[in-house]
């Protein structure tokens, strides 16, 4: 009679994570008597996956009833596959012995490959805000995918970026992999509404890449421009001085009026107008009674924006001459403030 052969017909099996893998194995004879065992890997370091004689295998089931006397099908199913299950599986026939069974013949092995989807990319930006013209770094991370081949692209407002570096770890063989990429982005004053997108394409995603986004509104700081103007109002001895604070982001802003270097009033930007580009405008005014002053008055509008060092703009108010209009402002920007008289 021909000697028993252990046949594993599939050289390789490809399974998606979470699915069930079927590892096929048949014997060509019932002799010699003895159990079948399944191992992952070969040699002394192999892992016992299934033992026909004994054991508890929550994820492993046999395809046929191994207790039947004439059974020669030793195929198994492994449920809820993860990347950690990848490897080469051997179906091994043992010959009954005393005290131990003796390994008789092994199948050629079936390589189980696991396809696992990458996790949703997570994009993170710099810890501190930066101003236009500065270059900032964004990182993108995705984990747990297999096989190793993966494509990562960066976009800013739909335009592909080229200044980035990407690493896939580990370099050698692994059950699953991670990708880490860092992109450099130059900020512009128009970036409040901009988005940076990290796009990951992998064989498991069937052409529908995963995307992670970061809003540049969380990264950018657009410093304000200041303009101080005066125009007469009401009586001839009163002058309205306005401070136009334009094109700033984020909204956090505190304004202080100084008269000849002395603090007159401090207020926080509240009722602001938003520009199309996402920046804000705000206006504060001061009502000055010039008859109360013998000398010229230096009025300073001092603005502290988003915790940064204060910027200021000054205006010299001539009290000797009859006050006349020295500037104007548009209705749209005139959002109002508190009035103050100087006596």
């Amino acid at each position: 009679e021909e000697e028993l052969q252990v046949i594993q017909p599939d050289k390789s099996v490809l399974v998606a994570a979470g699915e069930t893998a079927t590892l096929r194995c048949t014997a060509t004879s019932l002799i010699p008597v003895g159990p079948i065992q399944w191992f992952r890997g070969a040699g002394p370091g192999r892992e016992l996956i299934y033992n026909q004689k004994e054991g508890h295998f929550p994820r492993v089931t046999t395809v046929s009833d191994l207790t039947k006397r004439n059974n020669m099908d030793f195929s198994i199913r492994i449920g809820n596959i993860t990347p950690a299950d990848a490897g080469t599986y051997y179906c091994v026939k043992f010959r009954k012995g005393s005290p131990d069974d003796v390994e008789f013949k092994s199948g050629a092995g079936t390589e189980l490959s696991v396809r696992a989807k990458p996790s949703a990319p997570v994009v993170s930006g710099p810890a501190a805000r930066a101003t236009p013209q500065h270059t900032v770094s964004f990182t993108c991370e995705s984990h747990g995918f297999s096989p190793r081949d993966i494509t990562l692209k960066w976009f800013k407002n739909g335009n592909e970026l080229s200044d980035f570096q990407t690493n896939v770890d580990p370099v050698g063989e692994s059950v699953s992999y991670s990708i880490h990429s860092t992109a450099k982005v130059v900020l512009t004053r128009e970036d409040v509404h901009s988005q940076v997108i990290c796009e990951v394409a992998h064989v498991t995603l069937q052409g529908d890449p995963l995307r992670g986004t970061a809003n540049l509104s969380e990264t950018i700081r657009v410093p304000p421009t200041l303009e101080v103007t005066q125009q007469p109002v009401r009586a001839e001895n009163q002058v309205n001085v306005t401070c136009q604070v334009r094109k700033f982001y984020p909204q956090r802003l505190q304004l202080t009026w100084l008269e000849n270097g002395n603090v007159s009033r401090t207020e926080t930007a509240s009722t602001v107008t938003e520009n199309k580009d996402g920046t804000y405008n705000w206006m504060s005014w001061l009502l000055v009674n010039v008859s109360a002053h013998r000398d010229d008055v230096k009025l300073t509008c001092q603005v502290e924006h988003d915790g940064q060092p204060a910027v200021s703009k000054s205006h010299d108010l001539k009290v000797s001459a009859h006050p006349k209009e020295q500037g104007s402002n548009t209705a749209a920007e005139n959002t109002g403030s508190n009035e103050r008289n100087i006596y």
Epitope: R40, P44, G45, R46, E47, L48, I49, Y50, N51, K53, E54, G55, H56, F57, P58, R59, V60, I78, A84, D85, D100
Partner: nanobody, 124 residues
Framework: QVQLQESGGGVVQAGDPLRLSCVAS????????MGWFRQAPGKEREFVAG????????YYADSMKGRFTISRDNAKNLVYLQMNSLKPEDTAVYYC?????????????????WGQGTQVTVSS
């Protein structure tokens, strides 16, 4: 070289549960098959449960089946033994063991490394 350190032992009432932990260091944990053994006073050390390196296959001594569950966390280098419905005859020193090869209940013979043990006392 592999270092094993058991914890979680103590004195419990009959019928109570207890979970033992064993942390391994010194070698890639996911390359080691792990097991639990116990030794009662005046008796030989006996096999309790074993688990393969990925956790896919588990083995239990007949007297512990259904009451004890072995599990592992390869990310934390930990192996656990959850013991339910404890009996006074479960009183023993419980040892954690690591093996480079694993053949089911042959594990006691194949164990290369042993912990110092943790005492479990079940009072009636």
């Amino acid at each position: 070289q592999v270092q094993l350190q058991e914890s979680g032992g103590g004195v419990v009432q009959a019928g109570d549960p207890l979970r033992l932990s064993c942390v391994a260091s010194g070698r890639t944990f996911s390359s080691l098959d792990m097991g639990w053994f116990r030794q009662a006073p005046g008796k030989e050390r006996e096999f309790v449960a074993g688990i393969s390196r990925s956790g896919i296959s588990q083995y239990y001594a007949d007297s512990m089946k259904g009451r004890f569950t072995i599990s592992r966390d390869n990310a934390k280098n930990l192996v656990y033994l959850q013991m339910n419905s404890l009996k006074p005859e479960d009183t023993a020193v419980y040892y954690c063991a690591a093996a480079l090869t694993f053949r089911g209940s042959d594990l006691p013979r194949d164990s290369n490394y042993w912990g110092q043990g943790t005492q479990v006392t079940v009072s009636s």
